[in-house]
Interface confidence: low
């Protein structure tokens, strides 16, 4: 009876920095007792380790067992459906899960105003699961870049943008007053990782922030 159940149609990783989640799509017509078995293979150690015998969700947090992702050749995962004594064939991730698959994010963006400039500070992510020595800046130690998207409210202007190579940036507001909203997307110039836009941070600039000089 080993292969009576259909296999999960697809299995994939969605990952941010030290937040590595395996996802899969459910089998058609699954019953209330259907659950999913998850196994993990680390490249270089060619054997599958069972991680979960019976997950009833459609995702599983593999961060704790892939903490060495950033220092390894990567992983593959596989999932199969289980229902009582019946189980499906395995469905394996179709790409290797490596550091290249991690979507880059920022922790937060802090804005302040100084003499008509908006000064921005990008806080890098500090996930609780990360080992103490594995900081974002130690793993991505070179070529960190950020796209800064700026929107002025009110105003009928699009997002416009600039690129910076530091966690600190400044925006000259050209004497404008109003609310300025900023988003940041990280990248690493030497890598192909996707980046995710941060949530928008806004700051209001009024006349009081401009110093009059003679």
């Amino acid at each position: 009876h080993g292969t009576e159940l259909p296999s999960p149609p697809s299995v994939w990783f969605e990952a941010e920095f030290f937040h590595h989640i395996l996802h899969w799509t459910p089998i058609p017509n699954q019953s209330e007792s259907t659950c999913y078995e998850v196994a993990l293979l680390r490249y270089g150690i060619e054997s599958w380790n069972s991680i979960s015998n019976c997950s009833q969700t459609l995702s599983y947090d593999l961060t704790a067992v892939t903490l060495d992702l950033y220092h390894s050749n990567g992983y593959r995962a596989r999932v199969r459906a289980v229902d009582g004594s019946r189980h499906s064939n395995w469905t394996v991730t179709n790409t290797r899960f490596s550091v290249d698959e991690v979507t880059l994010t920022v922790g937060s963006v802090n804005l302040e105003i100084h003499n008509g400039f908006i000064l921005g500070k990008i806080q890098l992510p500090r996930p609780k699961m990360a080992p103490a020595n594995d900081t974002y800046e130690s793993i991505f130690s070179h070529f960190r870049e950020y796209e800064i998207a700026i929107r002025k409210v009110p105003g009928n202007f699009t997002f416009t943008h600039k690129k910076v190579k530091h966690e600190n940036f400044s925006l000259l507001t050209s004497g404008e007053v109003g609310e300025f909203c900023v988003q940041v997307k990280p990248s690493v110039a030497s890598r192909s990782n996707k980046g995710m836009w941060s949530k928008e941070e806004c700051i209001s600039l009024t006349r009081q922030y401009f110093t009059v000089t003679n």
Epitope: E147, I148, A149, I150, R151, K152, G155, N156, F157, T158, F159, T160, H161, K162, K163, L171, L172, T173, S174, G175, E176, K185
Partner: antibody, heavy 120, light 107 residues
């Protein structure tokens, strides 16, 4: 809301120069990044140049380098585009257009266009 | 320079049709792409910015998608006033560059 109003049509002889103006209302010119785009009859849009606030200078498309000058009169909130050594292939509609202030921009607001005809 | 390639260069469609226009950049431009509509003897009008954000006042039947190198403008149900020429433009880096245009004509 920003509005851009351009100067009227011009007819010029080959070798001459033309200066097109673009008057801003609703915002001051210093709050904007002004660009110039042209369109030859029956052809597509071609960016000529514009102000890059990150560097604080005007960037020109290589094709027009040395022949075009883009200036601003902040006292009247008017931008100007001057094209010299005109030839017949410069016959086109010339548009000023602007977006926000920071870095390269999409062009959210356009002038109505100025037709320049170069003919002997 | 970043080349922008639009396709098709022209298309014929009827009122109510779903119309899709594509724009491909010669290198990655993130989301920094705008779409414009131009009618004969008129200045271009901005429809979409940042690849998928609708300009205020533009009908919701217009939508944009894509990032990196491949972008799409979709008109979900073509209206009589939508017959025009459409241009994409990248604003990731200078020089700013436009696609060659797509003329949408009445079938």
């Amino acid at each position: 809301q920003v509005q851009l109003v351009q100067s009227g049509a011009e007819v010029k002889k080959p070798g001459a120069s033309v200066k097109v103006s673009c008057k801003v209302s609703g915002f001051t010119l210093t709050e904007l990044s002004m660009h110039w785009v042209r369109q030859a009859p029956g052809k597509g849009l071609e960016w000529m140049g514009g102000f890059d606030p990150d560097d604080g200078e005007t960037i020109y498309a290589q094709k027009f380098q040395g022949r075009v000058s883009m200036t601003e009169d902040t006292s009247t909130d008017t931008a100007y585009m001057e094209l010299s050594s005109l030839r017949s292939e410069d016959t086109a509609v010339y548009y000023c257009a602007t977006g926000g202030y920071y870095g390269p921009v999409g062009m959210d607001v356009w002038g109505q266009g100025t037709t320049v005809t170069v003919s002997s | 320079d970043i080349q922008m390639t639009q396709s098709p260069s022209s298309l014929s469609a009827s009122v109510g049709d779903r119309v899709t226009i594509t724009c491909r950049a010669s290198q990655g431009i993130s989301i920094w792409l705008a779409w414009y509509q131009q009618k004969p003897e008129k200045a271009p009008k901005s429809l979409i910015y940042a690849a998928s954000s609708l300009q205020s006042g533009v009908p919701s039947r217009f939508s944009g998608s894509g990032s990196g190198t491949d972008f799409t403008l979709t008109i979900s149900s073509l209206q009589p006033e939508d017959f025009a020429t459409y241009y994409c433009q990248q604003y990731n880096s200078y020089p700013l560059t436009f696609g060659g245009g797509t003329k949408v004509e009445i079938k």
